[in-house]
C-alpha cells in the first residue's frame, strides 16, 4: 500500500513483500526489504517503546537506497503497520502484519497500565476501545464494570476490528468505570488491558458577558470583560475572543474554572479580558466564544470609547410635563455622557430627597402626584470626572379634575318649607378652572325607588332623565346666577348658585362641572314639605350627656298621626355624587321612636326627648305626618349632630416674664373643651381678685395688670375647668426696680 502524493520524478519505495496484509505465525522471523531512489527510513509498531531493541534495520549489500527490517521470533505485540518512507517526505509504502499469537491475541503495551477512553453520553456517538488484535478473525466481546455487563458484536452498531478495536455506542458504557476486551480461543479467555472510562461532557448552557451592554470608557481607562460559560459536568472549555484592535500591547487574558457547589449538575468557566489603557481603536464589538469541542456558544457586547469625559442633555428631554392628581409621574433625565453623570433634582431651588412618595434618581418619580407638586423642577447633571455641569428646567403642571366642596359634607337630607325661596350652591375647585358648570333637575317621584325595586350600591336611583334647568316646566321656578370666583382656604374656587324662587315641588338638582381632565358632580335632594316643622330644644348642637328635645310641629287641621322615626343603622349608602333615598317612600329603613304629644290651639307638637345624648344618637331623624284628607304621607328630616365631650385643654403656654415697675402686663389663656371650660386665675395659689389694677376680660381669657407694683410679683396660674376636669398653665412674673414712694405715703 502506498501513502502520500508523488513528488517530482520520485517513485514510491518498493517493498520486497508486495501485499497490503501479511499474516505470519508467532516465533517466526519477519524480514522486509525496502528499495527507493533516495534515503529511506522504517517505522514499526511500538517503535516508541523499548521493543526496538529486538528490531534490526540494516543497509542492503546489493545497492544504494535500500534497507532491510528484521525481527526474529515475532510476538503478538509486533502486529501492526510497517512503513518505509523517504526522509523528510510523505512518500511511503505500508504493509500491515498480523503476528498470530494465540497466547496473546490482543496487542498490549509492554506494561499493563490503564488506557483511557473518552466518551460523551450523546446517543448518536460511538466510541472505539483500542484493543487491537494480533489475529484478524477473533471472537471478541467487551466487558464493562461495575455492575459487570458484556457486549457482543451485533453486526450493526457494536463491532470489533483487529486494526481498530471495539466500537460501541458511547451511552451503553457511560455508566461504567472501566472496560476491557475479552477474546475466547479454545475455551481460554484472554483479556486486553483495562481502559478507564472518562465521561466528557460537551453541552454549553450559556455564555454570559459582564458587563453585558452599555459599556462606555474614555481613552486611557481600563476595560475588564468577564465571559462566563455554564456547562454540564465533565466539560473542558476553550475560550476565544474577537475584538477590534487585535494588536493590543496591554491586553491580558486569564481563564479559570469557577468552584460550584458540591452536587451541582453544572460547571462554570470564566475568561477575563483586560485592556489596561483603551484607545479609540478599541471601540467596537467584543465577542467571546466558548467551545467544548462539540459545541460552541458565543456572546457579544459593544464597547464605546470616548475621547474625553462629557455630559449633555438628550434631545428627548421634556420641558413641560402635564399630569392629573393621583397619577404616577415619571420625568426621566435623558442624557448623553460618559461616565454616567451624578443626577440631582431640585424643586423651586430646594434639593429633592427620595422618600416613599418621591424617588429622585435617573428618573424623577412622583408616586401619586398632588397639586403641591406643581412647580419648576431643575435637574443638574454633573460629570464625576470633569465636574462639568448641565442643568435643565422641567415645569410640572398638575391638573385637578373638578371637586365640589359640598360633596365632602354628609349629604343633607333636610326638608325645605313649601313656598320658601332657597339657594343651592356648588363650590368647585379644579385646575384648570371648569370651562362650564351646568345645572340639571328632575322630579323626586320620577326618581324614587319603590321597596320592590332592586337598587345597586353604585346607582341607587333608577332615574337618569335629567333635564336642563332652563326647562323648569312642572318644577320649581329656577334662576342660575353668574358664577362667582372666591378665594376659599387659600384656593381659587368657582361658586355656582341656583336660586329656587318658590319651593313648590320636591326635586333632585345636580350640578356638573367639567374641565380638561375630568368632571365632577353633586346631587342635591330638594325635598319640599308643606307640613311639619322640626325644631331642636335647647340647642342646635347638643354635647353628649346633655339632654335635647326634637319638636315636630304640624297644623292640626291639616295633619294627623305624627310619628318620630330614626333612619336605621344601615340606611342606603350615600356615595359621593349620589342621591339620598326619599325616606317617605321607603319606611323599611326607619326605626319608630317613642315620643310625647302636646297640643295648643292650632298645632300638634310631638316631642322626642333624648336624655343624656350620646354619639350613637347622631343621625337623621324623620317626622312623619299624614294629610287628613288625601292620606298622603309627609316627611321632614333633620340631621342631629351630637358633639363629643372633650376635657379642657389650654393652647399655648404662659411665658415667664420680667417687667419693670409701673409698666403693664397682658397675658392670654385660651382654653378649649366641650362643654366649654370656665377659666380662673390664681396668684401664688390664691384666687386672683379683680381690682382697679387687675382686669379680666373675654370670659377670663385675657388678664391685664396695669401699673405693676413689686407685690404683683409671683407665680400666676391659669386654670380651665369643666365637669371633665381641669387643665392649668403657670408662669412667674418678676417685677424689677425700686418702688417709688407716693405722696399718699
Amino acid at each position: 500500500a502506498s501513502v502520500g502524493l508523488p513528488s517530482v520524478s520520485l517513485d514510491l519505495p518498493r517493498l520486497s513483500i508486495q501485499k497490503d496484509i501479511l499474516t505470519i505465525k508467532a516465533n517466526t522471523t519477519l524480514q522486509i526489504t525496502c528499495r527507493g531512489q533516495r534515503d529511506l527510513d522504517w517505522l514499526w509498531p511500538n517503535n516508541q517503546s523499548g521493543s526496538e531493541q529486538r528490531v534490526e534495520v540494516t543497509e542492503c549489500s546489493d545497492g544504494l537506497f535500500c534497507k532491510t527490517l528484521t525481527i526474529p521470533k515475532v510476538i503478538g505485540n509486533d502486529t501492526g503497520a510497517y512503513k518505509c518512507f523517504y526522509r523528510e517526505t510523505d512518500l511511503a509504502s505500508v504493509i500491515y502484519v498480523y503476528v498470530q499469537d494465540y497466547r496473546s491475541p490482543f496487542i498490549a503495551s509492554v506494561s499493563d497500565q490503564h488506557g483511557v477512553v473518552y466518551i460523551t453520553e450523546n446517543k448518536n456517538k460511538t466510541v472505539v476501545i483500542p484493543c487491537l488484535g494480533s489475529i484478524s478473525n477473533l471472537n471478541v466481546s467487551l466487558c464493562a464494570r461495575y455492575p459487570e455487563k458484556r457486549f457482543v458484536p451485533d453486526g450493526n452498531r457494536i463491532s470489533w476490528d483487529s486494526k481498530k478495536g471495539f466500537t460501541i455506542p458511547s451511552y451503553m458504557i457511560s455508566y461504567a468505570g472501566m472496560v476491557f476486551c475479552e477474546a475466547k480461543i479454545n475455551d481460554e479467555s484472554y483479556q486486553s488491558i483495562m481502559y478507564i472510562v472518562v465521561v466528557v461532557g460537551y453541552r454549553i448552557y450559556d455564555v454570559v458577558l459582564s458587563p453585558s451592554h452599555g459599556i462606555e470608557l474614555s481613552v486611557g481607562e481600563k476595560l475588564v470583560l468577564n465571559c462566563t460559560a455554564r456547562t454540564e459536568l465533565n466539560v473542558g472549555i476553550d475560550f476565544n475572543w474577537e475584538y477590534p484592535s487585535s494588536k493590543h500591547q496591554h491586553k491580558k487574558l486569564v481563564n479559570r474554572d469557577l468552584k460550584t457547589q458540591s452536587g451541582s449538575e453544572m460547571k462554570k468557566f470564566l475568561s477575563t479580558l483586560t485592556i489596561d489603557g483603551v484607545t479609540r481603536s478599541d471601540q467596537g464589538l467584543y465577542t467571546c466564544a466558548a467551545s467544548s469541542g462539540l459545541m460552541t456558544k458565543k456572546n457579544s457586547t459593544f464597547v464605546r470609547v470616548h475621547e474625553k469625559p462629557f455630559v449633555a442633555f438628550g434631545s428627548g428631554m421634556e420641558s413641560l410635563v402635564e399630569a392629573t392628581v393621583g397619577e404616577r409621574v415619571r420625568i426621566p433625565a435623558k442624557y448623553l455622557g460618559y461616565p454616567p453623570p451624578e443626577i440631582k433634582w431640585y424643586k423651586n431651588g430646594i434639593p429633592l430627597e427620595s422618600n416613599h412618595t418621591i424617588k429622585a434618581g435617573h428618573v424623577l418619580t412622583i408616586m401619586e402626584v398632588s397639586e403641591r407638586d406643581t412647580g419648576n423642577y431643575t435637574v443638574i447633571l454633573t460629570n464625576p470626572i470633569s465636574k462639568e455641569k448641565q442643568s435643565h428646567v422641567v415645569s410640572l403642571v398638575v391638573y385637578v379634575p373638578p371637586q365640589i366642596g359640598e360633596k365632602s359634607l354628609i349629604s343633607p337630607v333636610d326638608s325645605y318649607q313649601y313656598g320658601t325661596t332657597q339657594t343651592l350652591t356648588c363650590t368647585v375647585y379644579a385646575i384648570p378652572p371648569p370651562h362650564h358648570i351646568h345645572w340639571y333637575w328632575q322630579l323626586e317621584e320620577e326618581c324614587a325607588n319603590e321597596p320592590s325595586q332592586a337598587v345597586s350600591v353604585t346607582n341607587p336611583y333608577p332615574c337618569e332623565e335629567w333635564r336642563s334647568v332652563e326647562d323648569f316646566q312642572g318644577g320649581n321656578k329656577i334662576e342660575v346666577n353668574k358664577n362667582q370666583f372666591a378665594l376659599i382656604e387659600g384656593k381659587n374656587k368657582t361658586v355656582s348658585t341656583l336660586v329656587i324662587q318658590a319651593a313648590n315641588v320636591s326635586a333632585l338638582y345636580k350640578c356638573e362641572a367639567v374641565n380638561k381632565v375630568g368632571r365632577g358632580e353633586r346631587v342635591i335632594s330638594f325635598h319640599v314639605t308643606r307640613g311639619p316643622e322640626i325644631t331642636l330644644q335647647p340647642d342646635m348642637q347638643p354635647t353628649e350627656q346633655e339632654s335635647v328635645s326634637l319638636w315636630c310641629t304640624a297644623d292640626r287641621s291639616t295633619f294627623e298621626n305624627l310619628t318620630w322615626y330614626k333612619l336605621g343603622p344601615q340606611p342606603l349608602p350615600i356615595h359621593v355624587g349620589e342621591l339620598p333615598t326619599p325616606v317617605c317612600k321607603n319606611l323599611d329603613t326607619l326605626w319608630k321612636l317613642n315620643a310625647t304629644m302636646f297640643s295648643n290651639s292650632t298645632n300638634d307638637i310631638l316631642i322626642m326627648e333624648l336624655k343624656n345624648a350620646s354619639l350613637q344618637d347622631q343621625g337623621d331623624y324623620v317626622c312623619l305626618a299624614q294629610d287628613r284628607k288625601t292620606k298622603k304621607r309627609h316627611c321632614v328630616v333633620r340631621q342631629l349632630t351630637v358633639l363629643e365631650r372633650v376635657a379642657p385643654t389650654i393652647t399655648g403656654n404662659l411665658e415667664n416674664q420680667t417687667t419693670s415697675i409701673g409698666e403693664s402686663i397682658e397675658v392670654s389663656c385660651t382654653a378649649s373643651g366641650n362643654p366649654p371650660p370656665q377659666i380662673m386665675w390664681f396668684k401664688d395659689n390664691e384666687t386672683l381678685v379683680e381690682d382697679s389694677g387687675i382686669v379680666l376680660k373675654d370670659g377670663n381669657r385675657n388678664l391685664t395688670i396695669r401699673r405693676v407694683r413689686k407685690e404683683d410679683e409671683g407665680l400666676y396660674t391659669c386654670q380651665a375647668c369643666s365637669v371633665l376636669g381641669c387643665a392649668k398653665v403657670e408662669a412667674f412674673f418678676i417685677i424689677e426696680g425700686a418702688q417709688e414712694k407716693t405722696n399718699l405715703e
Epitope: 506494561s111 488506557g115 483511557v116 461495575y146 461504567a176 472510562v197
Partner: antibody, heavy 120, light 107 residues
C-alpha cells in the same frame, strides 16, 4: 523497595508557576502510571489525575484541567506536576502515588508530599 | 461525580475499644472501595482495598465491610498508634473520589 521521593516545599506568589517532581525507584518506572493527589491544609484528599508513564498520556480530573500539566522524564524515572497562574486556593500538599497493581485503582505507594504555599 | 460522605468527622475512644467508621457513597460502588490511614504530617497509607481485603503489612485488627453504597472500617481493639485520620476512596467511576475523613483520638 518501591520509593517515591518528592521535591521540597515551595513558596510562590499569586500568578507564578510551580513544578513539583516525583522520583521513582525500586521498580520499572514505565510499568506503572503516576497518580497525583492534593490535600489542602486541614482538608481531605482530592484526586487530580494521572500520567501513563509508557505513553506519556496524561488524564486530568475535571477540576484540574487547564492550569495543571503532568510530564515525565523516563531517563531519570521522574514524573512532574506543573501548576501555572497560582492562586491562594492552590496552597496544599501535593502527593504523587502509585497503584499496587494495574487492575485495581487503590494507591499502595505514596510520596512524602510537597507543600506548595501561595502567598502575596 | 460520586460523592463520598464519611461519619463521624471525628471520634474519641479508649485504648482497647472497638471503633467503627462509616462511609456512604452517592452511587453503588460494587465494593470498589479502599481505606487509608493518615497520621499527622505523614502521607496516607493503604489499609483495605476491594472493601474488605487487607493490604500487605496491615495489622489484622483492621477490617472492612459493606456493599452497595454503605461501607465501614472497624478497628477491633484501638491502639495508641492508631491515632490518625482515616479516609475512604471509591474507584468505581472516574474521577476517583475520597471521603472527607474521620479523625480518631484516644480519650
Amino acid at each position: 523497595e518501591v520509593q517515591l521521593v518528592q521535591s521540597g516545599a515551595e513558596v510562590k506568589k499569586p500568578g507564578a508557576s510551580v513544578k513539583v517532581s516525583c522520583k521513582a525507584s525500586g521498580y520499572t518506572f514505565t510499568n506503572y502510571g503516576m497518580y497525583w493527589v492534593r490535600q489542602a491544609p486541614g482538608q481531605g484528599l482530592e484526586f487530580m489525575g494521572w500520567i501513563n508513564t509508557e505513553t506519556g498520556q496524561p488524564t486530568y480530573a475535571d477540576d484540574f484541567k487547564g492550569r495543571f500539566t503532568f510530564t515525565l522524564d523516563t531517563s531519570t524515572s521522574t514524573a512532574y506536576m506543573e501548576l501555572r497562574s497560582l492562586r491562594s486556593d492552590d496552597t496544599a500538599v501535593y502527593y504523587c502515588a502509585r497503584l499496587g497493581n494495574n487492575y485495581g485503582i487503590w494507591f499502595a505507594y505514596w510520596g512524602q508530599g510537597t507543600l506548595v504555599t501561595v502567598s502575596s | 461525580d460520586i460523592q463520598m460522605t464519611q461519619s463521624p468527622s471525628s471520634l474519641s475512644a479508649s485504648v482497647g475499644d472497638r471503633v467503627t467508621i462509616e462511609c456512604r457513597a452517592s452511587d453503588d460502588l460494587y465494593s470498589t472501595l479502599a481505606w487509608y490511614q493518615q497520621k499527622p504530617g505523614k502521607s496516607p497509607k493503604l489499609l483495605i482495598f476491594d472493601a474488605n481485603r487487607l493490604a500487605a503489612g496491615v495489622p489484622s485488627r483492621f477490617s472492612g465491610s459493606g456493599s452497595g453504597t454503605d461501607y465501614s472500617l472497624t478497628i477491633s481493639s484501638l491502639q495508641p498508634e492508631d491515632v490518625a485520620t482515616y479516609f475512604c476512596q471509591q474507584y468505581n467511576k472516574f474521577p476517583w473520589t475520597f471521603g472527607g475523613g474521620t479523625k480518631v483520638e484516644i480519650k
